[in-house]
């Protein structure tokens, strides 16, 4: 191997470089010194470094490492945060639409039920929003409360419109009768099943994305050990002590050092992989009654069907309720007659067809594809970080921590490192407490994701059929069916096709393609910066 070049006779270059790190030159020797007090950059001969300089280099190395780690996770963090924000907003828009559709149904078909119905519908959808964001609300209670509130209004406004004000204290009795007599048939149960399934999945999906952000933040802000700081200092700065300012660390050596520094973090890898695969399973199952977009936007139809069910059984119901709630009523009033034209006019309630290709489900799948390109993120982290720091190409004429070498040899470097501190010891320390905590959280969310992953086949549909409902023949390739049973069924082409409101948010005109070339393909970047369309505009 070549002898090291003679050290800078005046330490001039080292002085000028060090001044950029630490204004003032009091720590820098004017000429090379023996350096017997050095603990990290152990000199083979005279050196331009002092103990104080070494300490400054160690601090700088650790700060560098923090920024490199943040750089390595930059795109992954952007990907998850932006998608979490988009989905949260999109879910809120779906809830708003669902509320508006339901209110429109009441306004168009049962104007006498408004404004009370609007109030109950509003409360229901507020609870839906809160539930998605993690609030401790029971979905069955929400649905029961909606129907419990609606029935007295339906009874007094539609079934017994002549009821005097004095008889209006029967509300509590009517609320109770609603459940006892199953006045809405099995519709409340159908809605409970659909809403609870779809909202549970939506909620866990958002929770999982937020935990993904927390995982990256945890590793992003790790504080590195003193041992790691010393290894980094040797790799990045000890060459300067010999006046070798332009020399870069060997790539292989960088990988060894980073594996040592990142040993604890890499332990996340197994659980991170499982997280992405479990999330993929969840997303693959988010269709039909597990898709809140599909379920909530069809609620108006199912609620309408449930009111029709009450109307069809009005005669029988009025008699029974008359007896049941007699103590609250002075006398029995005749049931209202329902002309045929009171039933829903399908033409009136046409859902606007929005010309957007992208649905929430396609966006979810797109996110999973992008996340899968980061499935090896933690195991590849040492390599990522080395790719973000200056290293010598091809491992030729590079710094191996002790000297300038023509070619890097891992064995020699390891031996050299053992002279100062044990790399194996560094690896054996185990993960930091914060890393252990985040691993526990990942285990927990993975378990939740697995239990939430949808049953394959049509198991759930069968259960619904047994309750006396048609599950409908909505094949995967057909338009999605929205709504519960025959009469109220309205087909909405691909739901809202990812919601018109978000269109302006996504900078439609900023689509990649409005450029002088197609979206760039850059193989070097795709190993880490996977240039996915993190927040792709509507196509």
């Amino acid at each position: 191997q070549p002898p090291p070049p003679p050290p800078d006779a005046t330490c001039h270059q080292v002085r000028s470089f060090f001044q950029r790190l630490q204004p003032g030159l009091k720590w820098v020797p004017e000429t090379p010194v023996p350096g017997s007090d050095l603990q990290v950059c152990l000199p083979k001969g005279p050196t331009c470094c002092s103990r104080k300089m070494e300490e400054k280099y160690q601090l700088t190395a650790r700060l560098n490492m923090e920024q490199l780690l943040q750089s390595a996770s930059m795109e992954l963090k952007f990907l998850i945060i932006q998608n979490a924000a988009v989905f949260q907003e999109a879910f809120e828009i779906v809830v708003r639409h669902a509320k508006n559709y339901t209110n429109a149904m009441f306004k168009n078909n049962y104007p006498s039920l408004t404004p009370q119905a609007f109030e109950f519908v509003g409360e229901f959808f507020t609870d839906v929003s809160l539930y998605i964001l993690g609030s401790d609300i029971n979905v069955d209670d929400m649905v029961n409360e909606l129907f419990d509130s609606l029935f007295p209004v339906i009874y007094t406004q539609l079934m017994n419109p002549g009821l005097p004000d004095s008889a209006l204290d029967i509300n509590e009795c009517l609320r109770g009768a609603r459940r006892d007599l199953k006045v809405f048939g099995n519709f409340p149960k159908l809605i409970m099943t659909q809403v609870s399934k779809s909202l549970q999945v939506t909620r866990i999906f958002l929770q999982a994305l937020n935990l993904g952000i927390e995982v990256i933040n945890t590793t992003d802000h790790l504080k590195f050990s003193k041992d790691c700081g010393r290894m980094l200092t040797r790799m990045w700065y000890c060459s300067y002590c010999q006046g070798l300012m332009m020399v870069k660390p060997c790539g292989g050596y960088c990988n060894v050092v980073m594996q040592g520094c990142m040993a604890g973090v890499v332990e996340i890898d197994k659980y991170w992989r499982e997280y992405i695969l479990s999330l993929e399973e969840l997303v693959n199952g988010m269709y039909r009654i597990y898709d809140m977009e599909n379920v909530l936007l069809g609620l108006f139809s199912t609620i309408h069907d449930s009111i029709q069910y009450v109307q069809k059984n009005a005669g029988k119901l009025t008699t029974t309720i008359g007896k049941l709630c007699a103590h609250s009523q002075q006398r029995q009033y005749r049931s209202a007659y329902y002309p045929e034209d009171l039933f829903i006019d399908k033409k009136v309630l046409k859902v606007a067809h929005v010309e957007h290709e992208e649905t929430l489900s396609s966006r979810r799948r797109e996110l999973i594809q992008k996340l899968k390109s980061f499935i090896s993120f933690y195991s590849a982290l040492p390599g990522y970080i080395c790719s973000h720091s200056p290293v010598a190409e091809n491992d030729t004429l590079c710094w191996n921590g002790q000297e300038l070498v023509e070619r890097y040899s891992q064995k020699a470097a390891r031996n050299g490192m053992k002279n100062q501190f044990n790399l194996h010891e560094l690896k054996m320390k185990g993960p930091e407490p914060v890393v252990s905590q985040i691993i526990d959280k990942l285990k927990h969310i993975n378990q939740l994701l697995r239990t939430m992953s949808m049953p394959k086949g049509r198991v759930l549909d069968k259960n619904l059929d047994e309750e006396g409902f048609e599950s409908g023949d909505c094949g995967d390739d057909e338009d999605e069916c929205i709504g519960g049973s025959g009469d109220g069924m309205i087909k909405v082409k691909n739901q809202l096709r990812f919601l018109a409101e978000l269109a302006y948010d996504l900078d439609v005109d900023d689509a990649p393609g409005n450029s002088q070339q197609a979206t760039p393909k850059d193989n070097e970047i795709s190993t880490f910066h996977n240039l996915g369309n993190v927040h792709s505009p509507l196509k």
């Epitope: 920024q67 490199l68 943040q70 750089s71 930059m74 795109e75 963090k77 952007f78 990907l79 945060i81 932006q82 979490a84 924000a85 988009v86 949260q88 907003e89 937020n210 952000i213 933040n217 973000h388 720091s389 200056p390 978000l502 302006y504 948010d505 996504l506 900078d507 900023d510 990649p512 450029s515 002088q516 070339q517 760039p520 850059d522 070097e524 970047i525 910066h529 240039l531 996915g532 369309n533 993190v534 927040h535 792709s536 505009p537």
Partner: antibody, heavy 120, light 107 residues
Framework: EVQLQQSGPELVKPGPSLKISCKAS????????MTWVKQSHGKNLEWIGL????????TYNQKFKGKATLTVDKSSSTAYMELLSLTSEDSAVYYC?????????????WGQGTSVTVSS | DIVMTQSQKFMSTSVGDRVSITCKAS??????VAWYQQKPGQSPKALIY???NRHTGVPDRFTGSGSGTDFTLTISNVQSEDLADYFC?????????FGGGTKLEIK
């Protein structure tokens, strides 16, 4: 149309702190990170840091850690930068700039800038 | 930190000419380079992202090229309104860093 409206010019004495604001409109505020940039002497641009409005997550240039604090108010779609321990070195024009929705866009829309002069 | 060097502080050109502004990175930044134009008294405006892709509304006389450490912004058929400072930015590594700027003057 995406717009970033920054607070007006500031002439302040050296001392504790100053907070400047950047109100966003025309896009979904929580979705795009907001970055802050310092321009001194009419030329030199320095990246201060960025914040994700969705969850308040921040990344700083080490040089500005302890000098700048980034925050957001989602309800008013406003990003803030507080400059601490002001000295004449902090005299500059400060820009907020939105990081594009599509990851590699970098900073695609900029505010008009807030001129800060620190002088005793 | 990655240093972005724009060696030409000033460039003089005439209307209709073609001019190339260069930016050199101190280490490989792949394609994560953007270009900004700043006219006197205004805030910077995004021109190019990811080395060679034009932002919305940017005239096609602006083109970007390069990879690794050497990047170029070319303005063909220079117009008088192109009088401005031009900055490059790398976002491969934190902290993101800008070049020192090149002032384009029209003769």
């Amino acid at each position: 149309e995406v717009q970033l409206q920054q607070s007006g010019p500031e002439l302040v004495k050296p001392g504790p702190s100053l907070k400047i604001s950047c109100k966003a409109s025309g896009y979904s505020f929580t979705v795009s990170p907001m970055t802050w940039v310092k321009q001194s002497h009419g030329k030199n641009l320095e990246w201060i840091g960025l914040i994700h409005p969705y969850n308040g997550d921040t990344t700083y240039n080490q040089k500005f850690k302890g000098k700048a604090t980034l925050t957001v108010d989602k309800s008013s779609s406003t990003a803030y930068m507080e400059l601490l321990s002001l000295t004449s070195e902090d005299s500059a024009v400060y820009y907020c700039a939105r990081w594009g929705n599509y990851y590699p866009y970098a900073m695609d829309y900029w505010g008009q800038g807030t001129s800060v002069t620190v002088s005793s | 930190d990655i240093v972005m060097t724009q060696s030409q502080k000033f460039m003089s050109t005439s209307v209709g000419d073609r001019v190339s502004i260069t930016c050199k990175a101190s280490q490989n930044v792949r394609s994560t380079v953007a270009w900004y134009q700043q006219k006197p008294g205004q805030s910077p405006k995004a021109l190019i992202y990811l080395t060679s892709n034009r932002h919305t509304g940017v005239p096609d006389r602006f083109t970007g090229s390069g990879s690794g450490t050497d990047f170029t912004l070319t303005i063909s058929n220079v117009q008088s309104e192109d009088l401005a400072d031009y900055f490059c930015l790398q976002h491969w590594n934190y902290p993101y860093t800008f070049g020192g700027g090149t002032k384009l003057e029209i003769k």
